[in-house]
């Protein structure tokens, strides 16, 4: 039901300023999906920049089945997941390594979901059970934003009633929170 | 803000049709799927069926199969719920709603309007 | 059609009391589509609980749901005088069906 299958492509991208995001992804089971891991040297002399547009986000493609209860989506769905910390455009490697290449001293710059698309989905039953249809939200592009210190100390709430699709495989949080675990709001969820 | 804003109250006669309307802001209806609930006086939720205003499609219980009719205007971000051959039993309070999108494999209607009330009277 | 059935259909608990309902399936439904809403009279209802356990957005914590197959109830730890309201259970699978409502009200 979690991440079924996923493609690991890996696309640069230099976003644009948008409104205010959605909480970063913070995603717990990296066994089940192959997260990029930012690579490389890490540069010589700290580059500060105050310009959003000179970092760039990684967005990675992959794929998942769409579940509801027992019945599953007879194909699975494409979205993208955008890769926790944004990097000086002009320093991101091409390719994937796992070393922590880059940490800035000033603010903090997040890769996080910035448009999403809705889906259609046939979702398949089993013992005869008529087939349902649902809608799901996928995220369609990341953006780099830069996370205030109101961001951090608010643990990344929602700004929007639009805000965040939690990913599978982790406990649901959109405007909602978990019964147990008095948490915030939309915690972490992206 | 997510809102769903619901026409006023109707008073119509019996045999007659009516159309309540539902607009939706802070939020686009072709994303999602509205739904339609009844609620006769003093009495529990009766779920009418709902619409993809994306194509149009729309799902009823067999017991509003005939009775109702469910459509959306996408440019305009209203759902509407047209009921016809109207009797006192058609009395009631009616909602729309919407069927919040993908929480994590959990799908229920997350928002209400605050209905529309239709009297049956002659 | 899957038939919930709420019970008690009317109940009045004190404050602090702890407050139980329960809504039957008619049919084993997977936990996931068992939902709770809240409708105080006159207004519209609201979706309070969703996916058996999961709290929406401004429900206290006070509040917690459990169950599984064809057993459900929504919990109050300790009863305010806000939390008087109807409660329906609802399960959306292919359609889309309510309990009867639980009437909660204040001692």
């Known amino acids: 039901q979690g991440w079924q299958a996923f493609k690991n492509d890996a696309t640069e991208i230099i976003p644009e300023l948008g409104e205010y995001p959605e909480p970063p992804p913070e995603l717990e089971n990296n066994k089940t999906m192959n997260r990029a891991e930012n690579g490389g040297r890490p540069p010589h002399h700290p580059f500060e920049t105050k310009d959003v547009s000179e970092y760039s986000c990684r967005e990675l493609h992959f794929t998942r089945y769409v579940t509801d209860g027992p019945c599953r989506s007879a194909k699975p769905v494409t979205e993208l997941v955008c890769s926790g910390q944004c990097g000086p455009a002009r320093l991101l490697p091409n390719a994937i390594g796992r070393g922590k290449w880059w940490r800035p001293s000033g603010p903090d710059f997040r890769c996080i979901p910035d448009r999403y698309r809705a889906q259609r989905v046939q979702l398949l039953c089993p013992g005869g059970e008529a087939p349902r249809a649902r809608k799901v939200r996928l995220v369609a592009s990341c953006k780099c934003k830069r996370l205030t210190r109101f961001h951090n100390q608010s643990e990344l709430k929602d700004f929007g009633t639009e805000a965040a699709r939690p990913q599978k495989g982790r406990k649901p949080r959109p405007r909602a929170r978990s019964a147990k675990a008095n948490q915030a709001e939309l915690e972490n969820a992206y | 803000e997510v809102q769903l804003q619901q026409s006023g109250a109707d008073l119509v006669k019996p045999g007659a049709s009516v159309k309540l309307s539902c607009t939706a802001s802070?939020?686009?209806?072709?994303?999602?799927?509205i739904h339609w609930v009844k609620q006769r006086p003093a009495q529990g939720l009766e779920w009418i069926g709902r619409i993809d205003p994306d194509n149009g499609e729309s799902t009823y219980v067999p017991k509003f199969q005939g009775k109702a009719t469910i459509t959306a205007d996408t440019s305009s971000n209203t759902a509407y719920l047209q009921l016809r051959s109207l009797t006192s039993e058609d009395t009631a309070i009616y909602y729309c709603?919407?069927?919040?999108?993908?929480?994590?494999?959990?799908?229920?209607?997350?928002?209400w309007g605050q209905g529309t009330s239709v009297t049956v009277s002659s | 059609e899957i038939v919930l059935t709420q019970s008690p259909a009317l109940m009045a608990a004190s404050p602090g009391e702890k407050v139980t309902i329960a809504c039957s399936v008619s049919s084993s439904i997977s936990s996931t589509n068992l939902h709770w809403s809240q409708q105080k009279s006159g207004t519209s209802p609201k979706l309070w609980i969703y996916?058996?356990?999961n709290l929406a957005s401004g429900v206290p914590v006070r509040f917690s749901g459990s169950g599984s197959g064809t057993s459900y109830s929504l919990t109050i730890s300790s009863m305010e005088a806000e939390d008087a309201a109807t409660y329906y259970c609802?399960?959306?699978?292919?359609?889309?069906?309510f309990g009867s409502g639980t009437k909660l009200e204040l001692k």
């Open positions: 996916g058996t356990s």
């Open positions: 709603g919407r069927e919040g999108l993908d929480y994590g494999d959990y799908y229920a209607v997350d928002y």
């Open positions: 802070g939020f686009n209806i072709k994303d999602y799927y």
């Open positions: 609802q399960q959306w699978s292919t359609t889309y069906t």
